[in-house]
């Protein structure tokens, strides 16, 4: 078992004549995610066939506006990696199809009007465990940059993430017909627990290394589909002439799910309700203790020292499921205020302020003079979703509330003194200059610098600067 | 601009057959994360959904109906079939079909785009 | 199954009222959606995935909740909001909906 990561890095116009026009406009605002399909082998990159290595999908990214006129630049993306886990055996050869697609935000008639704006696929070869791959694929005018990689979960290790490694039972070997983990080799390998490829909705196992199928399905790897030979039905011959109108066997059929599982079907899979004591796609995990990591993204796993006595999981926030394995829609709770858009990061939840709020849940307001007061004769200036006090002289600070020392910076020139003034500031200026802040020499000859001192005011004065 | 259209016969008789067609336009079959449902609705009563097919031919049918159900698509032709055999006047109802939309790969995002329903009487 | 229990049955209101409905499923669900009928025309969709407002929805629809328990809110009703409402879940087959809310004009 592994996951595989996709990083975007850009999403905008390729080089070269015919610049795309923008997804988005002023009074069609929208916003960018993108989804990602996996396949194993070099297969076709036809987008109907199933993402039999999984599917990903990303957050929504930044609302974005196009200004008029203005050519299609890199557009806002989504935070944070696509992630696909897959649980099998990397395959080493993939193809994938990586879509973008933009989310309108205008008032639209019916539901969220989503539309496809590029499609990008390909094949190729990656080790699970390898550095970022980086890629840039381009569909029409559009380009699209990115980088990926597939890392095994623990306890898989390998290429392939097939090779199982736990913590030795004994400090000296592994048990019989086990060989050290290399590189780790204070731990062992473990035996793979179905074969490498097996069809996880259409396959099973029950000893390690099998791959059994479920009604419907044959093959080593149980992904090919039993042909319907004829319409003997429980339903009778269909007179369609497209042939013969048997459904396909669901995913329920025949019960994949071991240990006395219950199983439902989803919108497109199924899902094991599992016993205590069993875990797995399947349930078919047993015999669990925490030595085994039972619990998911980080749960942490009480109890259960011996195979008999049950193990209890306590899950991080974000995580819930008796092993910590599902998710909680966090963001459905909506706890950003004030029209904020709520990211589920996964560790944490952020929330992306509208413009005039602030905080971690945008609960503070920054927004307006409306009822807020500068103090000491202080002007209240609105910008940018905020406002700001522009202060009389001698006063500063967010509210205008603090005096502030014209003197603190030292104004007065060439080591003249500075005194406060309910007006300013005055420097008194040391012997042979003179100026509103001493800046100018007065001449041996008595003659300044300057054309003429101000009327009352004689060179050497202290200067009050206005 | 999204559209869903049933179509099919008002009035069949007990133990036939229904076979109802949904045609739509301003999306297609062929692009992933689309689906197509069928839901129904008894006079008076809830609505009840049927069956739905996606687009890389994942099928999924009401339990207590299954025996009685087949729904095909022809990509080609923007079009979603749905078969009914054994028709009981239990089954009178308005018949819609709607826009399924799967981003994530069983999460269904919305059923966003309904047709204007079919009312079928079965009655001999 | 998974049962979809809606209450009230029935609700009588007035315009400017805040109005809240409920509908509890009888399994956890991961999200919750939510469709206003009005008779003789078919059902449109209001809220996806819990709490996001399908477009051309008015503001003062809003939905929460989560597990087995959740809510649609109508914060200041509408002369056009009198209809019946619908929740449903998309967990697991049947994905089966709620027996309906009828917002009535008091």
């Known amino acids: 078992a592994g996951v595989f990561e996709l990083q975007i890095h850009s999403f905008g116009p390729g080089p070269g004549p015919g610049a795309p026009r923008s997804p988005c406009s002023a009074r069609l605002p929208c916003r960018l995610f993108f989804r990602v399909c996996l396949k194993p082998g070099l297969s076709e990159e036809a987008a109907e066939s199933p993402c039999a290595l999984g599917a990903a999908l990303s957050a929504r990214g930044p609302v974005y506006t196009e200004q008029p006129g203005a050519p299609a630049p890199d557009l806002p993306l989504p935070d944070g990696l696509l992630q696909v886990p897959f649980r099998d055996a990397w395959p080493g050869t993939f193809s994938f199809i990586i879509e973008t697609w933009r989310e309108e935000l205008g008032d639209q008639i019916g539901g969220p009007a989503w539309s496809l704006l590029a499609r990008v696929a390909g094949r190729r070869r990656l080790a699970a465990g390898g550095p970022w791959a980086r890629d840039i694929q381009r569909a029409g005018a559009w380009e699209l940059r990115f980088s990926y990689r597939a890392r095994c979960e623990p306890p898989a290790v390998g290429t392939a993430c097939t090779r199982l490694c736990r913590p030795r039972s004994a400090p000296s070997r592994c048990g019989p017909g086990l060989r050290p983990c290399a590189p780790l080799e204070d731990e062992c390998e473990a035996p793979l627990v179905c074969r490498a490829g097996c069809s996880p909705e259409h396959g099973f196992c029950e000893q390690p290394g099998e791959c059994r199928c479920l009604e419907g399905w044959t093959g080593p790897l149980c992904t090919v589909p039993v042909s319907t030979s004829s319409c003997l039905s429980p339903r009778g011959p269909s007179s369609a002439t497209t042939g013969c109108l048997v459904p396909g066997p669901g995913p329920c059929d025949g019960n994949p799910c071991a240990n006395g599982g219950s199983c439902s079907e989803t919108p497109r899979s199924f899902e094991c309700t599992c016993p205590r004591g069993f875990y797995g796609l399947r349930c078919e995990v047993s015999g669990v203790t925490c030595a085994d990591g039972p619990c998911f993204n980080g749960g942490l796993c009480v109890g259960g020292a011996d195979p008999d006595s049950a193990y209890i999981c306590h899950c991080p926030p974000g995580f819930q499921g008796s092993n910590c394995e599902k998710r909680v829609d966090r963001c459905s709770l909506q706890p950003c205020r004030n029209g904020g858009l709520c990211l589920d990061l996964g560790h944490a939840l952020r929330c992306r302020c509208r413009a005039g709020f602030a905080g971690p849940r945008c609960e503070h307001d920054l927004d307006d003079c409306a009822g807020r007061a500068c103090a000491n004769g202080g002007t209240c200036v609105e910008g940018g979703g905020a406002h700001r006090c522009s202060c009389a002289l001698g006063f500063g600070g967010r509210d205008c509330r603090e005096r502030a020392d014209p003197c603190a910076a030292r104004p007065c020139a060439h080591g003249g003194r500075c005194y406060a003034h309910f007006s300013g500031l005055v420097c008194a200026c040391a012997p042979g200059y003179m100026g509103a802040r001493c800046e100018f020499p007065v001449h041996p000859d008595g003659a300044s610098a300057l054309p003429a001192a101000p009327p009352g005011l004689r060179p050497g004065d202290p200067q009050r600067y206005l | 601009q999204i559209t869903l259209k049933e179509s099919g016969p008002t009035l069949v008789k007990p133990t036939q057959t229904l076979t109802l067609t949904c045609t739509f336009s301003?999306?297609?079959?062929?692009?992933?994360?689309?689906?197509v449902g069928w839901i129904r609705q008894p006079p008076g009563k809830a609505l009840e959904w049927l069956a739905h097919i996606w687009w890389d031919d994942v099928k999924r049918y009401s339990p207590s109906l299954k025996s009685r159900l087949t729904i095909t698509k022809d990509t080609s032709k923007n079009q979603v079939v749905l078969t009914m055999t054994n028709m009981d006047p239990v089954d009178t109802a308005t018949y819609y079909c709607?826009?399924?939309?799967?981003?994530?790969?069983?999460?269904?995002?919305?059923?966003?785009?309904w047709g204007q329903g079919t009312l079928v009487t079965v009655s001999s | 199954d998974i049962q979809m229990t809606q209450s009230p049955s029935s609700l009588s209101a007035s315009v400017g009222d805040r109005v809240t409905i409920t509908c509890s499923a009888s399994?956890?669900?991961?999200?919750m959606y939510w469709y206003q009928q009005k008779p003789g025309k078919a059902p449109k969709l209001l809220i996806y995935l819990t709490s996001n407002l399908a477009s051309g929805v008015p503001s003062r629809f809003s939905g929460s909740g989560s597990g087995t328990d959740f809510t649609l809110t109508i914060s200041s009703l509408q002369p056009e909001d009198f209809a019946t409402y619908y929740c449903q879940q998309w967990r697991s087959n049947p994905f089966t909906f709620g027996q309906g809310t009828k917002l009535e004009i008091k």
């Open positions: 301003g999306f297609s079959l062929s692009t992933s994360g689309m689906g």
């Open positions: 399994h956890s669900v991961s999200y």
């Open positions: 709607a826009r399924i939309v799967s981003f994530d790969n069983d999460v269904v995002s919305a059923m966003d785009y």
